[in-house]
Every structure is written in C-alpha cells, then in structure tokens.
C-alpha cells in the first residue's frame, strides 16, 4: 500500500460539555472520490476504533446513527467532532485516512491528537 501524510493537531481540550473538535488533513496525491476516515483511540498501548465513515467526494461525511462522531469534509480536510466525552476518555485520538478510489489505494495515519477531558465540577447547592 502507498503511504500518505496525515496532519492533525497535537493537543485539544474538550469543552465542559464533553465535546472535542479537530481537523484532520491529508495530502492527497490525486483526486480521490471515495475516502474512508477512521478515528482510533490509543491509551495504555491499546488501540480501539472510536468511529469510522466512508464518504464520496462532494458528499456529506456520514457516521453510523449511534456514533459519537460527526464530521464535515472540505477538499482534503475533514473536520471531526467527538461528543459525550468524559475524563476517563482522555487519550490519544488518531486520524486514519484511506483513499479507496480510484486506484492505487493509499493509507495515511496521523500522529494523533491528545484530547484532554475534564469532568465539570458539580454545581454546589446554594442557599438563598
């Protein structure tokens, strides 16, 4: 398989609502029309798949209905949003891009985005 460069930010801080967004950019060597984007989480040397979507260039990026990810694509950039994150989900989130069509097949894996998630403090009871 042919290698391809994928860039993503080094660090992202999730919002207080547990939402993290980052851009995954790939250096496409040609005009790909079918692209598969996968987000992987690496923690304690274990890698798990968070979500994946295949999109036809020019169409929306569609994840499965029960996915915690949403995203949009623009050219060689994919804007990814992961929601429902909690402190225990802190880890390295790796963007993997595969150019499925036309041949040849290309695979690109980013260095990962360290997403930090801080659970919000519960609001103290206020006496009035």
């Amino acid at each position: 398989c042919k290698a391809m460069h994928v860039a993503q930010p080094a660090v992202v801080l999730a919002s207080s609502r547990g939402i993290a967004s980052f851009v995954c950019e790939y250096a496409s060597p040609g005009k790909a029309t079918e692209v598969r984007v996968t987000v992987l989480r690496q923690a304690d040397s274990q890698v798990t798949e968070v979500c994946a979507a295949t999109y036809m260039m020019g169409n929306e990026l569609t994840f499965l209905d029960d996915s915690i990810c949403t995203g949009t694509s623009s050219g060689n950039q994919v804007n990814l949003t992961i929601q429902g994150l909690r402190a225990m989900d802190t880890g390295l989130y790796i963007c993997k891009v595969e150019l499925m069509y036309p041949p040849p097949y290309y695979l690109g894996i980013g260095n990962g985005t360290q997403i930090y998630v801080i659970d919000p403090e519960p609001c103290p009871d206020s006496d009035f």
Epitope: C1, E34, V47, T54, E98, M100, Y101, P103, L107
Partner: nanobody
Framework: EVQLVESGGGLVQPGGSLRLSCAAS????????MGWYRQAPGKQRDLVAS???????YYADSVKGRFTISRDGAKNTVYLQMNSLKPEDTAVYYC?????????????WGQGTQVTVSS
C-alpha cells in the same frame, strides 16, 4: 489472518469465457478494496479490476467492456467474469484484499489461478 482462495481458471479458446471466484475466510468486503491482478510470464503483476466498499469499480483499459468484477457479501466471495478472452489475457490471476486493521495496513493475496487462452 484472512485466507483468499481463487478458483475458476483453466484453458479456454480465444473468444471464450471464464468466471473466476475468490472466497474469503471472513467478511472483509465492508472495509477493504478487493482486486484482481494478473501476472504473465516475465511481466509484473498488474491490476485488472477492483471494487471498493462503496461500490466504485475500476477496470484496466485492456479489459474494459470484456471483464466484470462483482461481489457477494453473503458468500464472502468476489468474482471476475471474463468474456471475449484473448491470448494476451493468458496469465496467473490473483485475488487481493487491501486496506487496514486499526493501525496496521493489510495486503492479502490468494495463491493464484492459471488462465490460458489458446486454440
């Protein structure tokens, strides 16, 4: 490890037809590009046809209009229907699955099936 097993090759006369099958030991079509390659004696292995998870199909110029690639997800099998065969189609035909599992690229090959077009 996924196993790819080709069948359907043989000796056929020019103008004849053959259907090659490639049976996979698991459901790999949803994630991988499935392709048929061929290698003639003394030549390099070339892509003949491929089909993606999204259903996009590619054909080499030399086989367009004569060969048809298809897949059956229920049977975990990909096919290559070859019509109007020519002597220059003589080669060993290989099934290939290309993609990735987590962080690892995969590139599985079958053992190959011989196709000989001769009168």
């Amino acid at each position: 490890e996924v196993q790819l097993v080709e069948s359907g090759g043989g000796l056929v006369q020019p103008g004849g037809s053959l259907r090659l099958s490639c049976a996979a030991s698991g459901n790999i079509f949803t994630r991988n590009v499935m392709g048929w390659y061929r290698q003639a004696p003394g030549k390099q292995r070339d892509l003949v046809a491929s089909i993606t998870p999204g259903g996009n199909i590619y054909y080499a110029d030399s086989v367009k209009g004569r060969f048809t690639i298809s897949r059956d997800g229920a049977k975990n099998t990909v096919y290559l229907q070859m019509n109007s065969l020519k002597p220059e189609d003589t080669a060993v035909y290989y099934c290939n699955a290309r993609g990735s599992i987590l962080l690892d690229p995969i590139n599985y090959w079958g053992q190959g099936t011989q196709v000989t077009v001769s009168s």
